[in-house]
């Protein structure tokens, strides 16, 4: 089968990292510098992605695989394949069209990216606010007021919630 396929299309024998060169009687030529072919039988090599500006190279291009980019310090990736870099803000802020702005009262952001989110409404779960919220932290809800009646055992505050993990950028 391989032999038959080769007779039909000589390019099918060209492995990844090469291309079928029409200028040279369809022989398999290595990909030119800064280009790659990730599959066999290609008639052109794809030019490598260049990580420029706020992008930096996470993985170098090879003759068989494209480069991968991430973002320079102070920025984070957005979108599949890190198609864009977005400016970091401080915790307690969100990025707007006019730059980083503090979270409005009643909202918080515990990361360097994303938007400010409203504090948890403890009363919706029949609980009370144990620790007030800040721009950087959500409120901590405690037992309902009924649970705090005289004679009830003393309340041990819950351990602080773990911060969400940040993927390395």
């Amino acid at each position: 089968f391989e032999r038959t396929r080769s007779l039909q299309d000589p390019c099918s024998n060209c492995p990844a990292g090469t291309f079928c060169d029409n200028n040279r009687n369809q022989i398999c030529s290595p990909c030119p510098p800064n280009s790659f072919s990730s599959a066999g039988g290609q008639r052109t090599c794809d030019i490598c992605r260049q990580c420029k500006g706020v992008f930096r190279t996470r993985k170098e291009c090879s003759s068989t695989s494209n480069a991968e980019c991430d973002c320079t310090p102070g920025f984070h990736c957005l979108g599949a394949g890190c198609s864009m870099c977005e400016q970091d803000c401080k915790q307690g802020q969100e990025l707007t069209k006019k730059g980083c702005k503090d979270c409005c009262f009643g909202t918080f952001n515990d990361q360097k990216r994303g938007i400010c989110r409203p504090w948890t409404n403890c009363s919706l779960d029949g609980k009370s606010v144990l620790v007030n919220g800040t721009k950087e932290r959500d409120v901590v809800c405690g037992p309902s007021p009924a649970d705090l009646s005289p004679g009830a055992s003393s309340v041990t505050p819950p351990a602080p919630a773990r911060e969400p993990g940040h993927s390395p950028q």
Epitope: D46, C48, Q50, G53, G79, A80, S83
Partner: antibody, heavy 118, light 112 residues
Framework: QVQLQESGPGLVKPSETLSLTCTVS????????WSWIRQPPGKGLEWMGY???????NINPSLKSRVTISVDTSKNQFSLKLSSVTAADTAVYYC????????????WGQGTLVTVSS | EIVMTQSPLSLPVTPGEPASISCRSS???????????LDWYLQKPGQSPQLLIY???NRASGVPDRFSGSGSGTDFTLKISRVEAEDVGVYYC?????????FGQGTKLEIK
């Protein structure tokens, strides 16, 4: 091998919106950046903007208020909308595969002429 | 926006003779990874542009080796060692360092 094909009306009235679609065949749209470039008759090339398959866009500042680029990965297509057109927008419109987000346009469509006239 | 300037704008050449086109950018296209973000394109009559050279000097796969690119920073040259009839068309340089990418005005190569 990758092929691109532009489609859309060849005639648009002034002040209306020009809409074009580029269909990608022979490869998935789900990688690389995808650009629109135009060329007024007898003149040079102007890059309009790109989109990544995830939907991130970058538009030429000279056109930013009028250009929208969108992508439909299920159809392997991306689209251009240019609003409030005038005669100056008469051009051949090309779609192209952009290797680096604003550089090295390795694969081009054959182009489609759009005339703005009443 | 980076401005690209080409010369000459018209280039009559005898088949078999060499040809040279110059391209200058308003700022350096050499990036920190020692990569010059400059492409050369040829638009043959009635056709779409096609990529000839990327990164200043790398020939795109399938491009005949009579085409070569050289230069660094702000000054670049496209050379054709022996012009053939099929090389007629408009040649454009383009900077790919910053968005928006910008093209030169084009150089029209014609056969004498």
């Amino acid at each position: 091998q990758v092929q691109l094909q532009e489609s859309g009306p060849g005639l648009v009235k002034p002040s209306e919106t020009l809409s074009l679609t580029c269909t990608v065949s022979g490869g998935s749209i789900s990688s690389y950046y995808w650009s629109w470039i135009r060329q007024p008759p007898g003149k040079g090339l102007e890059w309009m903007g790109y989109i990544y398959y995830s939907g991130s866009t970058n538009i030429n500042p000279s056109l930013k208020s009028r250009v929208t680029i969108s992508v439909d990965t299920s159809k392997n297509q991306f689209s251009l909308k240019l609003s409030s057109v005038t005669a100056a927008d008469t051009a051949v419109y090309y779609c192209a595969r952009d290797q680096s987000g604003g550089g090295s346009f390795q694969h081009w469509g054959q182009g489609t002429l759009v005339t703005v006239s009443s | 926006e980076i401005v690209m300037t080409q010369s000459p704008l018209s280039l009559p050449v005898t088949p078999g003779e060499p040809a040279s086109i110059s391209c200058r950018s308003s700022q350096s296209l050499l990036y920190s990874n020692a990569y010059n973000h400059l492409d050369w394109y040829l638009q043959k009559p009635g056709q779409s542009p096609q990529l000839l050279i990327y990164a200043g000097s790398n020939r795109a796969s399938g491009v005949p080796d009579r085409f070569s690119g050289s230069g660094s920073g702000t000054d670049f040259t496209l050379k054709i060692s022996r012009v053939e009839a099929e090389d007629v068309g408009v040649y454009y340089c383009m900077q790919a360092l910053q968005t928006p990418p910008t093209f030169g005005q084009g150089t029209k190569l014609e056969i004498k």
